[in-house]
Interface confidence: low
Amino acid sequence: SEGRKTWRRRGQQPPPPPRTEAAPAAGQPVESFPLDFTAVEGNMDSFMAQVKSLAQSLYPCSAQQLNEDLRLHLLLNTSVTCNDGSPAGYYLKESRGSRRWLLFLEGGWYCFNRENCDSRYDTMRRLMSSRDWPRTRTGTGILSSQPEENPYWWNANMVFIPYCSSDVWSGASSKSEKNEYAFMGALIIQEVVRELLGRGLSGAKVLLLAGSSAGGTGVLLNVDRVAEQLEKLGYPAIQVRGLADSGWFLDNKQYRHTDCVDTITCAPTEAIRRGIRYWNGVVPERCRRQFQEGEEWNCFFGYKVYPTLRCPVFVVQWLFDEAQLTVDNVHLTGQPVQEGLRLYIQNLGRELRHTLKDVPASFAPACLSHEIIIRSHWTDVQVKGTSLPRALHCWDRSLHDSHKASKTPLKGCPVHLVDSCPWPHCNPSCPTVRDQFTGQEMNVAQFLMHMGFDMQTVAQPQGLEPSELLGMLSNGS
């Protein structure tokens, strides 16, 4: 999927929303506080400019900017391992003045039987073993400590947890004579949290468990368990929240049914059904109780597990997610798309939009893409004029204000942002589409025609002539 797009940051970014963390006094961490905007609503631009100016003038004082890297720490408890028995671990960049912790779960599909796990080990060993992990990683997107790249949480303690368990972060089985591979995704998260408590997490105010793709699904499967773990360990004051990016999948009917041969072609329900048994997978307790024994696979699907979660979760999902299309056996080759497939793709967007109807905190652009939050240009995409960092900032504010009785959304600060336009790339801020084979940029008109969209059909609801639409899309791509 990577080959189909190019993402570039604009050379410049809109000003970041105001930081909500105070500078630490005399070396000790200070509580972060929300800003009350009511007094400045009349002259917000001027106020924001002042805050930005202040942030920029203070930023050089921070020693953090000297090293952008997150440093690798292999788990001290070496019995919590990757698939091949090597110790799992995490990359950490501390921000001592901050009481926010961001734990990011990496994605990367899964394997669900001996055969496709062997194949994965041959071709993608980094996702099954820690043996060749680099000692440092650069934080990008939401993991960046640069305010320009990460206007949302640039000052947080950043933790990147590499995915090396191939189990959608759900497994709880160790390597043994019987088991060629360990699947310990759920246990890795628990162990990382335990070790981080000794590295400053114990003083956290907010822990945001985030993840992309399989990591996004991992967030849905583990966020409540992390909250429960911290409560049991004596840290009930740490607010645990989730941010699930590109992990909200549908167990819909495949475009073309194929036998469950490999990870990519196997229908998601069947892959997960087999996987849970192979991994000894665990799902959130409240969700598990809603389904019969053997039906736990249901809890891997966002729209089924979400209503059972206690922690607040923000869902980020492209309406036309490439991984979803892949498991649905939709492969956009060089050939123009037939009408049946076009309708299937449009219907997928409609279904996904429907599943997000009751998710108050969500960001779903009508784009064909996959993953966003750790891409450098994650600030570029907007839904109805609001960027993702801005929506997350509004979410933070809404959670802070939620002890007040009002459930109404904050004025001018939306958190439910789901595109309503009906075809892929109808949002002008979508990332550039590239031809899967030639790598050439396709303008939106080319892309839509390639996908078999009849320009008359697309133009009509917009009150346009097809020729006008083509011109507009070619120019606005």
Partner: antibody, heavy 119, light 111 residues
Framework: EVQLVESGGGLVKPGGSLKLSCAAS????????MHWFRQAPEKGLEWVAY????????YYADTVKGRFTISRDNAKNTLSLQMTSLRSEDTAMYYC????????????WGTGTTVTVSS | DIVLTQSPASLAVSLGQRATISCRAS??????????MHWYQQKPGQPPKLLIY???NLESGVPARFSGSGSGTDFTLNIHPVEEEDAATYYC?????????FGSGTKLEIK
Amino acid sequence: EVQLVESGGGLVKPGGSLKLSCAASGFTFSDYGMHWFRQAPEKGLEWVAYISSGSRTVYYADTVKGRFTISRDNAKNTLSLQMTSLRSEDTAMYYCARKHYNGGYFDVWGTGTTVTVSS
Amino acid sequence: DIVLTQSPASLAVSLGQRATISCRASKIVSTSGYSYMHWYQQKPGQPPKLLIYLASNLESGVPARFSGSGSGTDFTLNIHPVEEEDAATYYCQHSRELPPTFGSGTKLEIK
């Protein structure tokens, strides 16, 4: 630093030809659609031509169609505008500009090169 | 082609006051929640500089005293408080279809 620098302008007789160039630096040129604009003395801005990032798509203003040709060389980070059958009304400052990858706005402009068509 | 009518053609505003420039399109330039209207500033001898994109988004590096609003056919650029350096000609531009056209410009003078 993101930069566009035009060159190739000058004085030319009506019916003559001229080739303008635009050298790009500081960004991945091959990722962006590029445009030419012009501005006659004391007048407003007029769009001239567009070329997509991979040269697949080109568009021209009606006033220049058949006389001007836009092209690009991504290996050399260069945009060109070949102008033939020049007329006095083509006299203007010519700018190249980078189209932001979405939304159809122009976030980087060159400093311009002057074309004067006069006998 | 979509015609953009800018008004006024020129205006003089005192330092610290508000300048308001309007741009009306001959056809709707908004669709699916997005408005394809952008604003530029041009000073003599210089190329245009992007100020506002997609109607209301402030380009990075542009002072927060600039703001854009509007949808459909009617759009506004506001500058408040006006500063000396804001003396320039301002253009609106649409990208709803090809060709992208510009307004005729508004010359802002600081009193």
